[in-house]
Interface confidence: low
Amino acid sequence: ESGYAQNGDLEDAELDDYSFSCYSQLEVNGSQHSLTCAFEDPDVNTTNLEFEICGALVEVKCLNFRKLQEIYFIETKKFLLIGKSNICVKVGEKSLTCKKIDLTTIVKPEAPFDLSVIYREGANDFVVTFNTSHLQKKYVKVLMHDVAYRQEKDENKWTHVNLSSTKLTLLQRKLQPAAMYEIKVRSIPDHYFKGFWSEWSPSYYFRTPEINNSSGEMD
């Protein structure tokens, strides 16, 4: 028999799909970590639904998430970062669905920032640089970055370059002359931590020089 028999609003709760996904961000606010979860189905009625994490926590057994519109999140220093935690969707004291998750395997880095492109006339190349807050972190220091660029008119024709440093050189001859390019970058944990791509950095736009007819090179 359903545990919700006396509650008309919740009678059908067990028929719903409460599958969810989460990502962690370590040292996202000083030494504080965050954990964000959301339901896979955007139409789930989240009224009365709560998330709780238990296990692999420091000094406490469980923590409750805060709800912000359709997402649930925790900001805390209390993640042990060793072993699996049990994350449950709950109605009152009843767990509807649970997942065992190691928070070090669902890390989503912060988006890179300060992306810029400088043209070096003498070298006939473009130097792409960007910054990441992870250089200063204790935990998620080692990242793989994905630099994506495209000619502005080619809407879905992105060229991707993977690199571990925060500097990339694009050869002028590989780009179209007198064209406007859009470039952006994102990061994913590499080495010990695992997880997801960060959000993309804000895009940066740059124009390639025109071809100098006498030399066959761009201006």
């Epitope: 926590l57 420091v58 000094e59 970062l81 060793i82 072993g83 010990y192």
Partner: antibody, heavy 121, light 109 residues
Framework: EVQLVESGGGLVQPGRSLRLSCAAS????????MHWVRQAPGKGLEWVSG????????GYADSVKGRFTIFRDNAKNSLYLQMNSLRAEDTALYYC??????????????WGQGTTVTVSS | AIQLTQSPSSLSASVGDRVTITCRAS??????LAWYQQKPGKAPKLLIY???SLESGVPSRFSGSGSGTDFTLTISSLQPEDFATYYC???????????FGQGTRLEIK
């Protein structure tokens, strides 16, 4: 019943190798980090090595780094310690211990009875 | 690496005595400290975790306190079965690392 049973100890000459095994039962092995702790005759406890549930987090005491390798086989509920270039000072009773992280912090809540390693010529 | 120093190294006491063992960390470790009891020929047994939490099944005469660098294990009224060696233990989660104190041997006076 939660149980850890070590095996593989014995008498070995300096410079030789030995592999210790620890068979786990009574708990979900792949939910837990595992450790090797040793105790030389008449001495205190010395942590040797630890390995996270998924083998991605591994640590060694400075005294064994580069000589010992910890690994696990979750399908077999087994933990291992490969000991190479053994020295007389590695002579000890070697315990396998289960980590219980859900209590907050690292605690070794279940221990085996140990297997004795003697390094002597 | 963090060092743990226990004091005293050994002590003699009588049944019914109140006994205190201290453990000092070379740097702050919050409450990341556990205490173990070991009897001759036996594996260590967890007594206290997270500095002050009593492990299930451990008698309430055992208690732990402290935070940061200074920690204490107290046995309020010694029983005959309490004569053993006691160890404090600290952990670091990343990188994975565990440290034990050198032990305190508790003997019958």
């Amino acid at each position: 019943e939660v149980q850890l049973v070590e095996s593989g100890g014995g008498l070995v000459q300096p410079g030789r190798s030995l592999r210790l095994s620890c068979a786990a039962s009574g708990f979900t092995f792949d939910d837990h980090a595992m450790h090797w702790v040793r105790q030389a005759p008449g001495k205190g406890l010395e942590w040797v090595s630890g390995i996270s549930w998924n083998s991605r987090g591994i640590g060694y005491a400075d005294s064994v780094k580069g000589r010992f390798t910890i690994f696990r086989d979750n399908a077999k509920n087994s933990l291992y310690l490969q000991m190479n270039s053994l020295r007389a000072e590695d002579t000890a009773l070697y315990y396998c211990a289960k980590d219980e992280y859900s209590r907050g912090y690292y605690v070794l809540d279940v221990w085996g009875q140990g297997t004795t390693v003697t390094v002597s010529s | 690496a963090i060092q743990l120093t226990q004091s005293p190294s050994s002590l003699s006491a009588s049944v019914g005595d109140r006994v205190t063992i201290t453990c000092r960390a070379s740097q702050g470790i919050s409450s990341a400290l556990a205490w173990y009891q070991q009897k001759p020929g036996k594996a260590p047994k967890l007594l206290i975790y997270a500095a002050s939490s009593l492990e299930s099944g451990v008698p309430s005469r055992f208690s732990g306190s402290g935070s940061g660098t200074d920690f204490t294990l107290t046995i309020s009224s010694l029983q005959p079965e309490d004569f053993a060696t006691y160890y404090c233990q600290q952990f670091n989660s990343y990188p994975l690392w565990i440290t034990f104190g050198q032990g305190t041997r508790l003997e019958i006076k």
